[in-house]
Interface confidence: medium
């Protein structure tokens, strides 16, 4: 932003009537009127080009220094050439100097030179030869020049005068300031530039209306420069929530839009599902029967939970069900859908039903299914099983309806085999199973299954035709899990339950029954 | 010495026409600006015309302009005055005045000049 | 275009006298005035310009003062050579003006 200038002293400006001290009095400068573009304008010039030495001061008036640190001196004079004289006028110069006094007071008519400092030498960049002087072609120069910084109250500008022709046309005192600001949300106060070329002034802005401070950013800050220009912007704010940027400020939210946090994008219209939001709404509310779960942003539709799944087959193979189904028609408006698998048993006998969980396996975790099959294992024969799956979503704990679909099965395999240890030696276990007489004609062969406890890496396999088996090579004094499992011509019978052996600890050697 | 010599004036019909020189000497002719002042008989000074040192700008009185053109030729070091349509009261005599800023101590220039040297006058009158 | 007067149009004097002639502008043309000395069938003569400066060869005993509307022409010591008429003439504007004389006569 471009600096902004307070004038301390405009001579152009004032028409003539500020009445500066010439010195010596009635010598030297004069002011003088002239007529340039049709407009009176004044100056103060002198040009005693022949006499020799000359020491013609000119004061302003006693300048208030105020809130200024450094000011800038702008003056636009005309020198004349000293060839455009005849003989050249060998006293005469070119230049002239510019002074200043720092006071607590006005000193009013008594100038005193001791007091003033000089500034600087100032010379003209083009000079006015005879030619221009006669047409009239006035050869503006423009110097600037800057002091600071200043302590006292007060100062007076002084221009001596050593035996040039030379006119002031304007003499402009003024400080800078950056201006009022607003930047990236922030309104920035005016500031007075400091007076130390390279130091810049740190200013903290303040967020407008409606905006913060993003969380973890960094405050609003700039550099006021010495110049009066903002440089380097640290931090910014954004439109809270429910409020969004039009040019410097933070407006709320039209209804039917929302803004859930504070952030550099606009208001959203409310998505589909919502009903319609007031003015500077945060968030947009669910239609009835419409939720949105604690994870869901703000911007997407609010969701249902999903209808049931819309097919479902339970296909038995022998202690083995395969359940398939097809994905809800209605998925709520949702992508997150999961299923759960229960399962329920009956003894046709008695007609009792129970929860059948821990007694079944299945191929993968029932609950939080993504896929739309899975395979239960180790059914029991002359069973009824009633399977429920449900579909379910991200909204469907905010409801207390299900959404499930049921198939049942009834089992005709083997009973599980009832497993004995007959025997165990520090390398082997000798093992023997039983199945009801009725049901052995169905029975192909059986499956030994053993692991060591504790190891869910690998597992050992024997199948054999009788009731027996001997499991050689093992290891001393270890536990393994062993289970046993009819195989028939349908599949796979249920299996017996796992049991625990464990080898002799080679100290205790013999070969006992168990 | 500067010296300045109007000529061409005499006697002419009211809607007639005259041409006045000025003949310059004695400084350099190009850096002056140039004027025509007259006085009619028994009368104050009146400002007629002028012409910048390089013929321009030009500048008249409103009683003469569109009538009379001033015109200069630095190379013969002459001034002119061509006066067409002619009236009865433009009898006077008339100066060849000029101006030299180089004495004129002021940093900025007059608006206008003022007449550091005249010539005698030459004599104009229209009468029928 | 601007207005010049002087008074008074005559005025008789003495060899020796104080003599004060007045110029008045019909509006401010700052210091921008020059002072013309004529003798009867001779060409006038610089004798003052930008109101206080005296023009080269022009005895010290002529002077000018004054600035924005009026201004003054003074001989301080009347000589025989000074019987003549004196004219201003401002140079604030293009259509340069002259007062319209003050005759000097001898008493």
């Known amino acids: 932003a471009q600096g902004k200038e307070v004038v301390l002293l405009d001579f152009a400006a004032a028409g003539g009537e500020l009445g500066w001290l010439t010195h010596p009095y009635g010598k030297g400068w004069d002011l003088m009127q002239n007529i340039m573009n049709d407009m009176p304008i004044y100056m103060y010039s002198v040009c005693n080009v022949m006499s020799g030495d000359q020491d013609n001061w000119l004061r302003t008036n006693w300048v208030y220094r105020g809130e200024a640190e450094r000011i800038f001196i702008e003056l636009k004079f005309t020198v004349r050439d000293c060839n455009s004289f005849p003989g050249g006028a060998s006293s005469c110069k070119e230049t002239f100097n510019l002074y200043y006094a720092e006071s607590d007071l006005d000193y009013g008519t008594n100038f005193q030179k001791r007091l003033f400092t000089k500034i600087d030498t100032i010379a003209p960049d083009e000079i006015t030869v005879s030619s221009d002087f006669e047409a009239r072609h006035v050869k503006l120069n423009v110097e600037e020049r800057s002091v600071g910084p200043l302590t006292r109250k007060g100062f007076y500008l002084a221009f001596q005068d050593i035996g040039a022709c030379v006119a002031l046309l304007s003499v402009r005192v003024y400080y800078k300031k950056c201006p009022e600001l607003l930047q990236g949300l922030a309104h920035f106060p005016e500031t007075i530039a400091g007076s130390d070329a390279p130091s810049l002034a740190t200013v903290a802005g303040t967020c407008v209306d409606h905006a913060v401070v993003p969380p973890g950013g960094e405050e609003p800050r700039m550099h006021c420069a010495v110049d009066g220009e903002w440089l380097v912007p640290i931090g910014q704010c954004l439109c809270q929530a429910g409020y969004e940027k039009v040019e410097d400020a933070c407006q709320a939210c039209s209804p039917g839009f929302f803004k859930f946090e504070a952030s550099e994008s606009p208001c959203l219209e409310c998505p589909e599902h919502t009903l319609p939001s007031p003015e500077g709404a945060t968030s947009c509310e669910c239609e009835e029967g419409f939720f949105r779960a604690p994870q869901d942003p703000a911007s997407m539709p609010c969701t249902r939970p999903p209808s049931a799944p819309h097919y479902l087959t339970a296909v038995g193979m022998g202690a083995k069900v395969e359940l398939r189904w097809t994905p809800p028609q209605d998925s709520g408006g949702r992508e997150d859908i999961v299923y759960s698998v229960t399962c329920e048993q009956c003894w046709p006998e008695s007609g009792e039903c129970g929860p059948c969980e821990a007694s079944v396996r299945y191929s993968e975790p029932p609950h939080g299914l993504t896929r739309t099959s899975v395979t239960v294992s180790d059914l029991e024969p002359h069973m009824n099983y009633t399977f429920t799956v449900e579909a379910r979503n991200g909204v469907s704990g905010l409801v207390t309806s299900r959404s499930f679909r049921t198939a049942s099965v009834s089992i005709n395999q083997t009973e599980p085999p009832k497993v004995r240890l007959e025997g165990r030696s520090t390398t082997s276990l000798s093992v023997s199973w039983s199945i009801p007489p009725p049901q052995q004609s169905r029975v192909w062969k059986y499956e030994v299954t053993y692991r060591k406890k504790g190891d869910s890496n690998s597992y050992n396999v024997r199948r054999t035709e009788g009731f027996s088996v001997t499991l050689d090579d093992l290891a001393p004094d270890t536990t393994y899990l062993v289970q046993v499992q009819a195989l028939t011509q349908e599949g796979q019978g249920a299996g017996s339950k796992v049991h625990e052996f464990q080898t002799l600890s080679p100290e205790g050697s013999g070969n006992l029954a168990v | 010495e500067v010296q300045l010599l109007e000529s061409g004036g005499g006697l002419v019909q009211p809607g007639g026409s005259l041409r006045l020189s000025c003949a310059a000497s004695?400084?350099?002719?190009?850096?002056?600006?140039m004027a025509w002042v007259r006085q009619a008989p028994g009368k104050g000074l009146e400002w007629v015309s002028r012409?910048?040192?390089?013929?321009?700008?030009?500048h008249y009185a409103d009683s003469v302009k569109g009538r009379f053109t001033i015109s200069r030729d630095n190379s013969k070091n002459t001034l002119y005055l061509q006066m067409n349509s002619l009236r009865a009261e433009d009898t006077a005599v008339y100066y060849c005045?000029?101006?030299?800023?180089?004495?004129?101590?002021?940093?900025?220039?007059?608006?206008?000049?003022?007449?550091?040297?005249w010539g005698q006058g030459t004599l104009v009158t229209v009468s029928s | 275009d601007i207005q010049m007067t002087q008074s008074p149009s005559s005025l008789s004097a003495s060899v020796g006298d104080r003599v004060t002639i007045t110029c008045r502008a019909s509006?401010?043309?700052?210091?921008?005035l020059a002072w013309y000395q004529q003798k009867p069938g001779k060409a006038p003569k610089l004798l003052i310009y930008?109101?206080?400066n005296l023009h080269t060869g022009v005895p010290s005993r002529f002077s000018g003062s004054g600035s924005g509307t009026e201004f003054s022409l003074t001989i301080s010591g009347l000589q025989p050579d000074d019987f003549a008429t004196y004219y201003c003439?401002?140079?604030?504007?293009?259509?340069?003006?002259f007062g319209q004389g003050t005759k000097v006569e001898i008493k």
């Open positions: 005045a000029g101006y030299d800023s180089g004495y004129d101590y002021v940093a900025v220039a007059g608006p206008a000049e003022y007449f550091q040297h």
């Open positions: 004695g400084f350099t002719f190009s850096h002056y600006m």
């Open positions: 012409i910048g040192p390089s013929g321009g700008p030009t």
């Open positions: 509006q401010s043309i700052s210091t921008w």
């Open positions: 930008k109101a206080s």
């Open positions: 003439q401002q140079y604030n504007a293009y259509s340069r003006t």
